[in-house]
């Protein structure tokens, strides 16, 4: 009887081991199938649109990442409140699961646009390095479904890179003119969004709780029109210490106003950055490593 019980235990352990191995094989097969599917759909560096079919709807890129899709590219997502799905670039590097909300890379897109364009989004949603603004509506839908971290990757023309990260990034609704809310800063580029770098500056240069402005919808704290003068849509105050939607110049520039792609705490007002990526991911994101 004792021998029988021992044999049962041994067989149970063996079954568990086999189940684990089968599960591992299933995961491996799923990954290989996905990679194969992605390679088939991925047209090299230029076209990175990845069609997952109608397998399921994803609220953001972190869900896609945790469902086993580890290749960066354009995917379709549908945040909880969003009436329709839309295309977005998912950055599956840097820990993975990043939803890219803005990109500047070469000045190929015009960012001097009106309220409707900034509301709905515009740009190149096909090419890997395509410039775009995801749309204030979409930013609102995304950032109200849970608490997000915003990471901003910045690069200059001298091959230097810095980043700024903000917890609890939120964009308000249309009624509140897509107001910006950000939490605790960390990073290497300095805190230009909250304007914490200088007490004299914070009240007029901070972007915290600023409403979004465009040339045709002025919600800034300035007697003039920041968006018109700086030729971009942004959360202007009076006017800015950061403007990542500014005019694309090649490094140092001169203009009537500081209208370049500016991150004051790194390169000041008179240097326009080479590239910018604004991307978000849930605060509590844990990569699914199974």
């Amino acid at each position: 009887l004792e021998d029988c019980a021992q044999e049962q235990m041994r067989l149970r352990a063996q079954v568990r081991l086999l189940e684990t191995r089968v599960k591992q094989q299933q995961v491996k097969i799923k990954q290989l199938l996905q990679e194969n599917e992605v390679q088939f759909l991925d047209k090299g560096d230029e076209n990175t649109v990845i069609d997952l079919g109608s397998k399921r709807q994803y609220a953001d890129c972190s869900e896609i990442f945790n469902d086993g899709y580890k290749l960066s590219g354009f995917y379709k997502i549908k945040p909880l409140q969003s009436p329709a799905e839309f295309s977005v670039y998912c950055d599956m590097s840097d820990g993975g699961g990043w939803t890219v909300i803005q990109r500047r890379s070469d000045g190929s897109e015009n960012f001097n646009r009106g309220w409707k364009d900034y509301e709905n989004g515009f740009g190149n949603f096909v090419q890997k390095h395509g410039e775009y603004w995801l749309g204030n509506k979409n930013l609102h839908f995304l950032t109200t479904q849970e608490d997000y971290t915003l990471k901003i990757d910045l690069a200059d023309f001298e091959k230097n890179s810095r980043y700024a990260q903000y917890k609890n990034f939120k964009v308000g609704d249309e009624k509140n003119f897509y107001e910006l809310n950000i939490g605790e800063y960390s990073g290497t580029a300095g805190d230009s969004l909250a304007g914490n770098f200088h007490p004299e500056v914070q009240w007029w240069a901070s972007h915290q709780r600023m409403k979004f402005s465009t040339w045709d919808r002025d919600h800034d704290n300035y007697e003039g029109n920041c968006a018109e003068e700086d030729q971009s849509g942004w959360w202007f105050n009076r006017c800015h210490s950061a403007n990542l939607n500014g005019v694309y110049y090649s490094g140092p520039y001169t203009a009537k106003t500081d209208n370049g792609i500016v991150w004051y705490t790194w390169h000041g007002w008179w240097y326009s950055l080479k590239s910018v990526v604004m991307k978000i991911r849930p605060n509590d994101f844990i990569p699914n490593v199974i």
Epitope: W204, E223, T257
Partner: nanobody, 127 residues
Framework: QVQLVESGGGLVQPGGSLRLSCTAS????????IGWFLQAPGKEREGVSC????????VYADSVKGRFTISRDSAKNTVYLQMNSLDPEDTAVYYC????????????????????WGQGTQVTVSS
């Protein structure tokens, strides 16, 4: 409140030059739009010139265009008003004023936007 100090005023002959300085201690003038104003005896204070917080934009009153030049020296935390071809009508007390953030993008230069003022420096143009 920003503490501003003007200097460089004095007595000068017609056709002569002066350079006025506006200096702030303990504050970074780069963060402020700076305006120069004059007040002649018995008259209202009026705008002469201004320079935006980031230094990209400057505006001049019609009466001084081509004669006066406004500039900044960030290292010295000072804004200058270089005045050439001075005329007896330029005689006045000259004030500098600060406005936090963006400003000075259009004419005319009005006093109401500016929130911090210096004590003024006297400029007398006479032979």
């Amino acid at each position: 409140q920003v503490q501003l100090v003007e200097s460089g005023g004095g007595l000068v002959q017609p056709g002569g030059s002066l350079r006025l300085s506006c200096t702030a201690s303990g504050f970074n003038l780069d963060f402020y739009t700076i305006g120069w104003f004059l007040q002649a005896p018995g008259k209202e204070r009026e705008g002469v010139s201004c320079i935006s917080n980031s230094g990209g934009s400057s505006v001049y009153a019609d009466s001084v265009k081509g004669r006066f030049t406004i500039s900044r020296d960030s290292a010295k935390n000072t804004v200058y008003l270089q005045m050439n071809s001075l005329d007896p009508e330029d005689t006045a007390v000259y004030y500098c004023a600060a406005l936090a953030g963006r400003g000075c993008m259009r004419s005319p230069i009005t006093t109401d936007e500016y929130d911090s003022w210096g004590q003024g420096t006297q400029v007398t143009v006479s032979s």
